[in-house]
């Protein structure tokens, strides 16, 4: 019961996390204009991974996509890549984990197979979460660097009498959404991995030799595929499959898969 709850909760947490990663990736407010030096601006600038926007005094917002690949900073491309990899891995992880859920029965799928799928999806969620956190952190670092560079530029040159104040950018809402979403996906993945341990059969199942001692006579019965000493209660010599060997029916096919301003 606890295993099912842990697995289900892990799935739900990961689902929320991946939805958040997708939302963050699509959001325009990765960086927003810093209003510290100009709190009365009638023109508010903000930028996302895919386009930059300007909200004017009329309330009208104009967004322009980055219609070039080669003209974009390498860091921005890297962040895009990390977020997309995170989304793809998370989506595959969700697909795998749906089939792995203990509460869902699909044919005669063994718990061991579900355990493997749970572990696979858990690892995918962990990597997905790490990708999102890394992507957001790289972007945040880029912002911090640019912020202090533009601050330095503001007070140098032309004797400090610069007419055009360079627009500085600070953290946008998407960064916080991304961090939280990445963290949730990571936590969900860890929960799935924990659930996997509980899903795997508790007792060691032996499928090798079973010895029946009656006085001095020993009955030898071959069973399974590997020779090992059997001390279990498998007195009727039923073959127990633990995932090491599967019939053809048991083999599962796992889902696998502008101008920069």
């Amino acid at each position: 019961m606890a295993v099912t709850a842990c697995q289900g909760l892990g799935f739900v947490v990961s689902l929320i996390g991946i939805a958040g990663i997708i939302a963050a990736t699509c959001m325009d407010q990765w960086s927003t204009q810093d209003l510290y030096n100009n709190p009365v601006t009638a023109v508010f600038n903000y930028q996302g991974l895919w386009r930059s926007c300007v909200r004017e005094s009329s309330g009208f917002t104009e967004c322009r996509g980055y219609f070039t690949l080669l003209g974009l900073p390498a860091m921005l491309q890297a962040v895009r890549a990390l977020m997309i990899v995170g989304i793809v891995l998370g989506a595959i992880g969700l697909l795998v984990s749906i089939f792995a859920l203990k509460c869902i029965r699909i044919g005669s799928m063994e718990d061991s197979a579900k355990a493997n799928m749970t572990l696979t999806s858990g690892i995918m969620f962990i990597v997905s979460g790490l990708c999102a956190i890394a992507g957001v952190s790289v972007f945040a670092n880029m912002l911090v660097t640019n912020f202090w560079m533009s601050t330095a530029n503001m007070y140098t040159g032309m004797g400090g009498m610069v007419q055009t104040v360079q627009t500085r950018y600070t953290f946008g809402a998407a960064l916080f959404v991304g961090w939280v979403a990445g963290g949730l996906t990571l936590i969900g993945g860890v929960m799935m991995c924990i659930a996997c341990r509980g899903l795997a059969p508790e007792e060691t199942n032996y499928k090798a030799v079973s010895y029946h001692a009656s006085g001095h006579s020993v009955a030898y019965k071959p069973g399974g595929f590997k020779a090992s000493t059997g001390f279990g209660s498998n007195t009727k010599n039923k073959k127990i499959y633990d995932g090491g060997a599967r019939t053809e029916d048991e083999v599962q096919s796992y889902p696998s898969k502008h101008d920069y301003v």
């Epitope: 601006t41 009638a42 004017e56 005094s57 009329s58 309330g59 009208f60 104009e62 055009t164 301003v261």
Partner: antibody
Framework: QVQLVQSGAEVKKPGASVKVSCKAS????????IHWVKQAPGQGLEWMGY????????NYNLKFKDRVTMTSDTSISTAYMELSRLRSDDTAVYFC????????WGQGTLVTVSS | DIVMTQSPDSLAVSLGERATINCKSS????????????LIWYQQKPGQPPKLLIY???TRDSGVPDRFSGSGSGTDFTLTISSLQAEDVAVYYC?????????FGGGTKLEIK
């Protein structure tokens, strides 16, 4: 087409308040800010502030901040500008304006403050 | 506050001639976010509300004749009427659309010589 229709002329005594309305049509009322501009007789234009019907936010010119209140009623697509503690120098035509670059203006409301 | 200074205060130009009105702001109206200048030009005739001519310093509003053009960047801007028509007699205002409070120039009265 986009239209801003303002309420009629008002005559007020000093110290009183006046509330001018601006009814919008032809566009999504909550998408654009409604700005208010004052023009005293024979004078130039003076921005008073704006109301954002979408979120109720507003921004006032400090010159009017303590006396002006801008509100909106999205159900009837109408913006209001209330000016309190009227003085003789508040005698002016008050315009509401909206759209990109203030593309659309109301016809103006003459407010006369006289004892 | 950004102070908008228009020159001249009044201007008399012959029909068909070029009219030029200048506007200077005390601070730059250039937005580095989209590389645009946030200056607006209006035309106002007696008893009427102002009419938008140019926004973002050089973008003509729809329906505005192409004899009207705006130019300039940073702090210095110009409205040009390439060939003055009788209906162009009006007061012209420039406006800072970059920083609150939004401020207007004092106006330039354009007349026919």
């Amino acid at each position: 087409q986009v239209q801003l229709v303002q309420s009629g002329a008002e005559v007020k005594k000093p110290g009183a308040s006046v509330k001018v309305s601006c009814k919008a049509s032809g566009f999504t009322f909550t998408s654009y800010n409604i700005h208010w501009v004052k023009q005293a007789p024979g004078q130039g234009l003076e921005w008073m502030g704006y109301i954002s019907p979408g979120n109720g936010g507003s921004n006032y010119n400090l010159k009017f901040k303590d006396r002006v209140t801008m509100t909106s009623d999205t159900s009837i697509s109408t913006a209001y500008m209330e000016l309190s503690r009227l003085r003789s120098d508040d005698t002016a035509v008050y315009f509401c304006a909206t759209g990109r670059g203030f593309a659309y203006w109301g016809q103006g409301t003459l407010v006369t403050v006289s004892s | 506050d950004i102070v908008m200074t228009q020159s001249p205060d009044s201007l008399a130009v012959s029909l068909g001639e070029r009219a030029t009105i200048n506007c200077k702001s005390s601070q730059s109206l250039f937005n580095s976010g989209n590389q645009k200048n946030y200056l607006i030009w209006y035309q106002q005739k007696p008893g009427q509300p102002p009419k938008l001519l140019i926004y973002r310093a050089s973008t003509r509003d729809s329906g505005v004749p192409d004899r009207f053009s705006g130019s300039g960047s940073g702090t210095d801007f110009t409205l040009t009427i390439s060939s003055l028509q009788a209906e162009d007699v009006a007061v012209y205002y420039c406006q800072n659309d970059y920083s609150y409070p939004l401020t207007f120039g004092g106006g330039t009265k354009l007349e026919i010589k």
